[in-house]
Interface confidence: low
């Protein structure tokens, strides 16, 4: 599982190294909702209907990598199902195919932005606006991360289980 997913799981309070079977083949998209109480303060002040607040024009453009991730997430959704707590779970199985790529990407970016802010707890720059991305409006990949993360091996082989790094290894993860 990717760092982004691992982080989201930690934010959900799922601290075990065993991922839900549902998600074992789902990579590339965060499929767990961040708890409201874990949402950083600047996100609480953000209109949830405006997922692009604090994003730059550049970030709003549809990148190939974003499209790839959306495609992967769609495939994952359709083949593996979605965790019940996923922000994408309510009716998405029936409606996702009707959504535009732009909408899916916007929602994906908003989720990543929430994750990033949650992990580092940084607030928006006061002067930030929709044209000026705050230092934290950017998408931090897998901000939850330092969780008890065994993410190293999870990243290196997304389907493999984290063997748990040895304490003495430089790559010791958090």
């Amino acid at each position: 599982m990717k760092r982004k997913e691992r982080i989201a799981r930690r934010l959900e309070g799922i601290e075990t190294d065993t991922q839900p079977i549902l998600l074992q083949s789902c990579t590339g998209l965060v499929t767990h909702r961040l708890l409201e109480e874990d949402t950083p303060r600047y996100m609480r002040a953000t209109d949830p209907a405006s997922p692009h607040i604090g994003r730059s024009n550049e970030e709003e453009e549809t990148s190939d990598s974003s499209l790839e991730k959306q495609t992967r997430s769609k495939q994952c959704t359709e083949t593996s199902g979605i965790h019940a707590d996923s922000p994408y779970s309510s009716g998405i199985m029936d409606t996702q195919s009707l959504e535009s790529k732009a909408e899916r990407i916007a929602r994906y970016k908003a989720e990543r932005r929430r994750q990033l802010a949650e992990k580092y707890g940084l607030t928006l720059d006061p002067e930030a606006d929709s044209e000026t991305p705050s230092r934290y409006s950017r998408s931090r990949k897998d901000p939850e991360a330092a969780e008890k993360r065994g993410v190293r091996s999870e990243r290196s082989a997304e389907s493999s289980r984290d063997a748990g790094s040895s304490y003495s290894r430089t790559e010791l993860s958090g």
Partner: antibody
């Protein structure tokens, strides 16, 4: 297994520029941030800045804002740290590390001397 | 900028004993979301730093449970029970609440 392989030691003249590299294996750097950290001889750690390789976004500590440039090449899965106008104060070991500071490169020793 | 202070430059300890390493921040690292944004690292001699603790009290993967982190909003403690020879090195705290992320000066753990 995640690994960060950094480029070899550098000996450069004052005023010159240098570009250090950090090549990741075992994961795609687009799925993470990459930090650079400085450690002067017998001293502590200083955070230089980071990059989101997917979109090129960067953030720097103010003291390195005009000194360092962090870039990334996703095709080669490599992050870079470039210094300009080097001085003896830049002599240090430089580490790259993943976004959660949980995987570190072995460090690159940069020596600035005439 | 947030200043991280580790008052003890070094701590001598006998193997098998417990030790506590302290760190203070010039500003609260407790976020309104309940998380305290503090890392602990160990840098063994001649090695790269290693992450031990994240968010003040969470044990990093692969780290022995002899290590534990605790603290308040501005005062933090890394405790090592039953110190072993491999624990020798410099311990750093680091805040990642605000830019620039900042480290403490480090506390060197030495065996008696």
């Amino acid at each position: 297994e995640v690994q960060l392989q950094q480029s070899g030691a550098e000996l450069v003249r004052p005023g010159a520029s240098v570009k250090l590299s950090c090549t990741a294996s075992g994961f795609n750097i687009k799925d993470d941030h990459m930090h650079w950290v400085k450690q002067r001889p017998e001293q502590g750690l200083e955070w230089i800045g980071w990059i989101d390789p997917e979109n090129g976004d960067t953030e720097y500590a103010s003291k390195f804002q005009d000194k360092a440039t962090i870039t990334a090449d996703t095709s080669s899965n490599t992050a870079y740290l470039q210094f300009s106008s080097l001085t003896s104060e830049d002599t240090a070991v430089y580490y790259c590390t993943t976004g959660e500071f949980d995987n570190w490169g072995q460090g690159t020793t940069l020596t600035v001397s005439s | 900028d947030i200043v991280m202070t580790q008052a003890a430059p070094s701590i001598p300890v006998t193997p098998g004993q417990s030790v506590s390493i302290s760190c203070r921040s010039s500003k609260s690292l407790l976020h309104s979301n309940g998380n305290t944004y503090l890392y602990w690292f160990l840098q063994r001699p001649g090695q790269s730093p290693q992450l031990l603790i994240y968010r003040m009290s969470n044990l990093a993967s692969g780290v022995p449970d002899r290590f534990s982190g605790s603290g308040s909003a501005t005062a933090f403690t890394l405790r090592i029970s039953r110190v072993e020879a491999e624990d020798v090195g410099v311990y750093y705290c680091m805040q990642h609440l605000e830019y620039p992320f900042s480290f403490g000066a480090g506390t060197k753990l030495e065996l008696k």
